[in-house]
Interface confidence: medium
């Protein structure tokens, strides 16, 4: 039996490294985890503006610089449902990369780090 398409029940935005803090030249991986079937298209938003990238549940930021700093979220779109957006995650680029997460660096859900 074909499962009826349903809206995402929840979106988690996972970030590596933990806390979203990375040294210049490092790599950040953002993963949009969605519980929906069939899997919806996933787009990415930075500071309120969609990024001009092909839809993908994973956003890789290699060799990051300060221009990559900002607030990121992922948006799941499905033909039969409205978009659903994850809580935001803040990415910070620091010279040392050893600072703790900035206060309020992830959404209120507490998501934003890999379990």
């Amino acid at each position: 039996r074909v499962r009826e398409p349903g809206p995402p029940e929840g979106i988690q935005l996972l970030v590596e490294p933990e806390g979203g803090i990375v040294a210049p030249g490092g790599t950040v991986t953002l993963t949009c985890a969605i519980s929906a079937q069939p899997p919806p298209q996933v787009h990415w938003i930075k500071d309120g503006a969609p990024l001009p990238l092909a839809p993908s549940p994973v956003l890789l930021l290699p060799e990051v610089g300060h221009e990559d700093e900002g607030t990121y979220s992922c948006v799941a779109t499905h033909p039969s449902h409205g978009p659903q957006e994850s809580p935001p995650v803040s990415i910070r680029v620091t010279e040392t990369g050893d600072e703790g997460p900035a206060e309020g660096s992830v959404g209120e859900s507490g998501l934003g780090t890999l379990a």
Epitope: G48, S73, P83, E85, S86, P87, P88, G107, E108, S109
Partner: nanobody, 116 residues
Framework: EVQLVESGGGLVQPGGSLRLSCAAS????????MGWYRQAPGKQLELVAL???????NYADFVRGRFTISRDTTKKTLYLQMNSLEPEDTAVYYC??????????WGQGTQVTVSS
Amino acid sequence: EVQLVESGGGLVQPGGSLRLSCAASGTIFSLNPMGWYRQAPGKQLELVALISDSGTANYADFVRGRFTISRDTTKKTLYLQMNSLEPEDTAVYYCRSTFAAGNFYWGQGTQVTVSS
């Protein structure tokens, strides 16, 4: 529970006009920046216009001078006045509450088709 409900879409000829509305409930509307986004078939989701909590409007280059975003805080409604519509404006238009209690909220979308 936050809800955003769009209306006002439809079929219009090139050069025509439409006014989209987005009614909000369950959120402190006057304190939330709001935006309109759109997605054409097979295309990327793209930002159309944003309006800040102070009422400052920002537009994508491809709609600047043709579209106007506004809000009525007493009615908790966001508007998008679309003039000089082009076939390339055909898309599903979504309104978005850009930040509310740590989460983002989207409407279900309204279809705009520009065709002769």
